[in-house]
């Protein structure tokens, strides 16, 4: 008579998280008398995850009725699947004995892996605006995904970039892991309006990737552009000297009027005209009395930009 | 007769996280009379998945009807699969035995390897904004993806990047697997508007990737080129200087007019022009009381922006 | 619904002999071990042994090893436990369970002379 | 046989204090086979943990098991009125199966 065997016909079983995981478990004899127990993992550390006759394992239900009449087949089902089920198991046949059963044959085990949805990846750009032509950093973070296969791409505007670092964490076997990744991405003035994507593709987003954005306005300071001209004006004793500031991001502006490097005024930029890359423009204007000096006068526009350090322009105003 | 053999026909299954696996046992004969187990792993540490006859494995359910006379098969399902799961399965047979039963025979196991969608993937930029032409770092990372096996890409703009670095963690094996990838991006000028954008594909993907996008805007500086210009002027005694500001970004920015190196009038920045690449223009003008000034005057336009050293631009203004 | 029903409470004269039944529904005790606990007045829990109702195959602490007799009767999906040789200090309510999760009611068994 | 020592024998302690229960094992125990189980005046045990850390359905979340080897703990985070009971713990690793004497959780 053959001896008992204990057949696992899969080797592995992949399942989603949430989803219930059969393992599959068959028998080819009735003999010897004894319970069937399912295991995760092997030796004295094994974890019983059903046990036929006692016990309280409510995720698990057998896929066949195992007490009716010469049943062979031991299949489980287990709910609700985790990151944490994963592991390789076991179906053994004890043989009934004094005082305890004895443990007779197992199966060769059936690792199951779950896979696991990537969290939303979350982009976050630098704590510091930097200036184009800089390269600023941005990160990429997705959590609790299975198995470790995971793929990540990073875009600026739809184009994809090459300058960044990835890291898949733990390194070692994990029930779910997270990935981390690095971009630099090196700014022109054009960026206002700009956005990087990170797009994380999973086994278990079936093609349809995750991605998360970042703005690269909340990275980008476009220092602004100054031109001080001279209006006409009617009035014979009177100057008007203007001050055009051009294209800055983010909004943030204070312009200080400067006669002869003298403060005359001080304008926080209030009404902005949008430029339709993202960058502003102002004018602020000083109203000089021309008979109030004898000689010729520098009047200097000078702006401090979201809190960098000044820059300024000069114009020399003629007194004839 | 013929020994009892446990077939396990699949080496292998793989299932989507929160889906079932059916994990495939089927026994060559009823003799020996006995219970099967499904185990998790081989070995002491091995752990048990399904009981025949006592225990509560609730995502366990068999097939076919275990009892029904003659069974051989004896396949499970495991529901809400999710990466912990992921292990070799093994459909073990015991003999009943005094005083316990003893194992009998074990398929040969069946490997469940879980696929996990990767997690959105999460794009963060430099915490410091760059200016053009220089190089800044996004990261990209996305979790809990499963298998291993994953692509990244980068993108600026719909330009694929070719500077970067990816991981994918951990380097052994695991339920779930982390991405973490740094991409190196050289800003220009006119990255105001651009985007990265990280692109992951994964197996469970089905061919559509998931996308995660930062905005170079946020993490460009552009600095403004400053032109101090005189304007006509109708009265004689007046002149009007203006510096305009352009191509900054970002927005804030703060002017300073200097009269022959004297603060004559700081403005912030309000209302800015937009340029079509993002930037922002801005002018201020200084209007200069030629009266008030003997000799020639040096106006300057000293621009500070983002919080950057101020850059400036003088103009002679000629007293005649 | 699980549900295990105890017999009545008993009386018995010490070197008595009593025997309790646990009749179970929602399930066949086939599909189970049933198991026996004794409580004592005021005491914590004793395991007394179980039964295979499949097979009929009995498991027995040492402490009751020879008096206890568990049987099974699957045609009525009933279990049953028979004290014998009965002493004061067997007087406890004794729990029939169902593979250590579901429990019958308790019967109260009083020794005394 | 495994003997199962549970300590303390009486905990007095007030709603919204965290109890301990300890059970430690003559000889190791395979964390799959320790269950706990919950026991009012006058009706039958009703299991309260499975399999060292798993709280049975209905179970309040402020219950945790936990432990591995010889020594095992039940934790009640924030004690409420209902909480107070007879604890035991309970091994079914091998025959014979054998039950803690009990902790009796009291209102101080």
């Known amino acids: 008579e053959d001896e008992l065997q204990v057949i696992q016909p899969e080797k592995s079983v992949s399942v989603a998280a949430g989803e219930s995981a059969t393992l599959r478990c068959a028998m080819t004899s009735l003999i010897p008398v004894g319970p069937i127990m399912w295991f995760r993992g092997a030796g004295a550390g094994r974890e019983l995850i059903y046990n036929q006759k006692e016990g309280h394992f409510p995720r698990v239900t057998t896929v066949s009725e195992l007490t009716k009449r010469n049943n062979l087949d031991f299949s489980i089902s287990i709910s609700n699947i985790t990151p944490a089920d994963a592991g390789t198991y076991y179906c053994v046949k004890f043989r009934k004995g004094s005082p305890d059963d004895v443990e007779f044959k197992s199966g060769a085990g059936t690792e199951l892996s779950v896979r696991a949805k990537p969290s939303a990846p979350v982009v976050s750009g630098p704590a510091v605006r930097a200036t184009p032509e800089h390269t600023v950093s941005f990160t990429c973070e997705s959590h609790g995904f299975s198995p470790r296969d995971i793929t990540l791409k990073w875009f600026k505007n739809g184009n994809e970039l090459s300058d960044f670092q990835t890291n898949v964490d733990p390194a070692g076997d994990s029930v779910s892991y997270s990935i981390h990744s690095t971009a630099r991405v090196v700014l022109t003035r054009g960026d206002v309006h700009s956005q990087v994507i990170c797009e994380i593709a999973h086994i278990t987003l079936q093609g349809d990737p995750l991605r998360g954005t970042a703005n690269l306005s909340e990275a980008i300071r476009v220092p602004p552009t100054l031109e001080v001209t001279q209006q006409p004006m009617r009035a014979e004793n009177q100057a008007n000297v203007t001050c055009q500031v051009s294209n800055f991001y983010p909004r943030g502006l204070q312009l200080t009027w400067l006669e002869n490097g003298n403060v005359s005024r001080t304008e926080t930029a209030s009404t902005l005209i949008e430029n339709k890359d993202g960058t502003y423009n102002w004018m602020s204007w000083l109203l000089v009395n021309t008979c109030a000096h004898r000689d010729d006068v520098v009047l200097t526009c000078q702006v401090e930009h979201d809190g960098q350090q000044a820059v300024s322009k000069s114009y020399a105003l003629e007194i004839s | 007769e013929d020994e009892l053999q446990v077939i396990q026909p699949e080496k292998s299954v793989s299932v989507a996280a929160g889906e079932s696996a059916t994990l495939r046992c089927a026994m060559t004969s009823l003799i020996p009379v006995g219970p099967i187990m499904w185990f998790r792993g081989a070995g002491a540490g091995r752990e048990l998945i399904y009981n025949q006859k006592e225990g509560h494995f609730p995502r366990v359910t068999t097939v076919s009807e275990l009892t029904k006379r003659n069974n051989l098969d004896f396949s499970i399902s495991i529901s809400n699969i999710t990466p912990a799961d992921a292990g070799t399965y093994y459909c073990v047979k015991f003999r009943k035995g005094s005083p316990d039963d003893v194992e009998f025979k074990s398929g040969a196991g069946t490997e469940l390897s879980v696929r996990a969608k990767p997690s959105a993937p999460v794009v963060s930029g430099p915490a410091v904004r760059a200016t053009p032409e220089h190089t800044v770092s996004f990261t990209c990372e996305s979790h809990g993806f499963s298998p291993r096996d994953i692509t990244l890409k980068w993108f600026k703009n719909g330009n694929e990047l070719s500077d970067f670095q990816t991981n994918v963690d951990p380097a052994g094996d695991s339920v779930s697997y982390s991405i973490h990838s740094t991409a190196r991006v050289v800003l220009t000028r006119g990255d105001v508007h651009s985007q990265v954008i990280c692109e992951i594909a994964h197996i469970t993907l089905q061919g559509d990737p998931l996308r995660g996008t930062a905005n170079l805007s946020e993490a460009i500086r552009v600095p403004p080129t400053l032109e101090v210009t005189q304007q006509p002027m109708r009265a004689e005694n007046q002149a009007n200087v203006t510096c305009q500001v352009s191509n900054f970004y970002p927005r804030g920015l703060q002017l300073t007019w200097l009269e022959n190196g004297n603060v004559s009038r700081t403005e912030t920045a309000s209302t800015l022009i937009e340029n079509k690449d993002g930037t922002y223009n801005w002018m201020s003008w200084l209007l200069v009381n030629t009266c008030a000034h003997r000799d020639d005057v040096v106006l300057t336009c000293q621009v500070e922006h983002d919080g950057q050293q101020a850059v400036s631009k003088s103009y002679a203004l000629e007293i005649s | 619904e699980v549900q295990l029903v105890q017999s009545g409470a008993e009386v018995k004269k010490p070197g008595a002999t009593v025997k309790i039944s646990c009749k179970a529904s929602g399930f066949n005790i086939k599909d189970y071990y049933m198991h026996w606990v004794q409580q004592a007045p005021g005491k914590g829990l004793e395991w007394i042994g179980r039964?295979?109702?499949?097979?009929?195959?009995?498991k027995y602490a040492p402490k009751f090893q020879g008096r206890v007799t568990i049987t099974a009767d699957t045609s009525t999906n009933t279990a049953y436990m028979e004290l014998s040789s009965l002493r004061s200090e067997d007087t406890a309510v004794y729990y029939c369970d169902r593979g250590l999760a579901y429990w019958g009611q308790g019967t109260l068994v009083t020794v005394s002379s | 046989e495994i003997v199962l020592t549970q300590s303390p024998a009486t905990l007095s302690l007030s709603p919204g204090e965290r109890a301990t229960l300890s059970c430690s094992a003559s000889?190791?125990?395979?964390?799959?086979?320790l269950y706990w189980y919950q026991q009012k005046p006058g009706q039958a045990p009703k299991l309260w943990i499975y399999?060292?850390?798993n709280l049975a359905s209905g179970i309040p979340a402020r219950f945790s098991g936990s432990g591995s080897g010889t020594d095992y703990t039940l934790t009640i985070s924030s004690l409420e009125p209902e909480d107070f009971a007879v604890y035991y713990c309970h091994q079914w690793s091998s025959y014979p199966y054998t039950f803690g004497q009990g902790t009796k959780l009291e209102i101080k």
């Open positions: 039964i295979d109702p499949e097979d009929a195959e009995t």
């Open positions: 000889s190791s125990v395979s964390s799959s086979y």
């Open positions: 399999s060292t850390s």
